[in-house]
């Protein structure tokens, strides 16, 4: 039996933050998991790690220096990412494995989530309008 | 005027246990994320944990990790940092750090820093 | 994770001196780059923060640039109370990290 997955098909990170919201078929109140985000078609990059243990504090990491912190619902978690760099857009994929009780569950790989990293773009000041064509 | 003052630092045997308060004051505490950050006698600055506003959610460096959890009480405005399993190189003034919630790790205030000593 | 290496690791100076120190990342940290002031005894003072941006109650003596990689943090004239040692600190990447210091003493 697998979790089934959803996620936004495409998020835009204004101000080189996003919030990805990853909703499961499943209630993760009262139990031992490990919530995750990976990054790239091949999921090969583990963005940050969102481990939960019944009802107690969340414990955030990410080995692949991302900023990042995680929020909690009864079949959610929301994965907030700060500083993301432009050439970090990517497809991202939420993972979820529910370690206790037995049995051992994860989930069906999900369709993931085109985060698009949006630069800030200096706008020309009106005082200073460039050369003008004659 | 922000005030953050540390307490429950001492002397402590490796392997035994410490419990750090840190009191808040002058703003609005449950807005805030809070750190740790500890600084060993002679030595430079190393950041420790962190608990977000609503203390739901924490992290802690891989020196630490698995010996130390971090907590708040946002109704007494405190800090909290449950130290086990203490070590020689936990030796260090801890000093808890303020930072908001838009840019978790820039520490705009720090309190005045606790003395943890593990020695036998 | 992200090293940050300062330099000098001191920097002798005398009052009224310009003071130029020095924080190199080992990978971009954009601008995502503080500064803090720490006297003996005393606890940190956040200087900079965003690599160029002075926090409240800071001298405008006080001035920092960078970004990328390369940071300064520059004391335009150096008065009795700014020997002190320096520390920067990225926020770009987790876990934040601290440089190793650079300790400013009267020459």
């Known amino acids: 039996n697998k979790i089934l997955v959803k996620q936004s098909p495409m998020l835009v990170a204004y101000d080189n933050a996003v919030n990805l919201s990853c909703k499961y078929s499943y209630n993760l109140f009262s139990r031992e998991f490990r919530a995750s985000l990976h990054k790239g078609l091949d999921s090969a990059v583990e963005v940050c790690v969102v481990y939960g243990n019944y009802s107690q504090q969340l414990q955030v990491y990410s080995k692949t220096g991302f900023n990042c912190d995680g929020k909690l619902g009864n079949e959610s978690v929301t994965f907030y990412l700060q500083n993301l760099y432009v050439n970090q857009t990517d497809i991202y994929f939420c993972k979820i494995e529910v370690m206790y009780p037995p049995p051992y569950l994860d989930n069906e790989k999900s369709n993931g989530t085109i985060i698009h990293v949006k630069g800030k773009h200096l706008c020309p000041s009106p005082l200073f309008p460039g050369p003008s064509k004659p | 005027e922000v005030q953050l003052v540390e307490s429950g630092g001492g002397l402590v045997q490796p392997g035994g246990s410490l419990r750090l308060s840190c009191a808040a004051s002058?703003?609005?505490?449950?807005?805030?994320?809070m750190h740790w950050v500890r600084q060993a006698p002679g030595k430079g600055l190393v950041w420790v944990s962190r608990?977000?506003?609503?203390?739901?959610?924490?992290s802690f460096a891989d020196s630490v990790k698995g010996r130390f959890t971090i907590s708040r009480d946002n109704a007494k405005n405190t800090l909290y940092l449950q130290m086990n399993s203490l070590r020689a190189e936990d030796t260090a003034v801890y000093y808890c750090a303020r930072a908001d919630n838009s840019s978790w790790y820039h520490f705009d205030y720090w309190g005045q820093g606790t003395l943890v000593t593990v020695s036998s | 994770e992200i090293v940050l290496t300062q330099s000098p690791a001191t920097l002798s100076l005398s009052p009224g001196e310009r003071a130029t120190l020095s924080c190199r990342a080992s990978q971009s940290v954009s601008s995502y780059l503080a500064w803090y002031q720490q006297k003996p005894g005393q606890a940190p003072r956040l200087l900079i923060y965003?690599?160029?941006n002075r926090a409240t109650a800071i001298p405008a003596r006080f001035s920092g640039s960078g970004s990328g990689t390369d940071f300064t943090l520059t004391i335009s004239s150096l008065e009795p109370e700014d020997f002190a040692v320096y520390y920067c600190?990225?926020?770009?990447?987790?876990?934040?990290?601290f440089g190793q210091g650079t300790k400013v003493e009267i020459k």
């Open positions: 965003d690599a160029s």
């Open positions: 608990v977000n506003s609503d203390g739901s959610s924490a």
């Open positions: 600190q990225q926020r770009r990447n987790w876990p934040p990290t």
């Open positions: 002058g703003f609005t505490f449950s807005s805030y994320w």
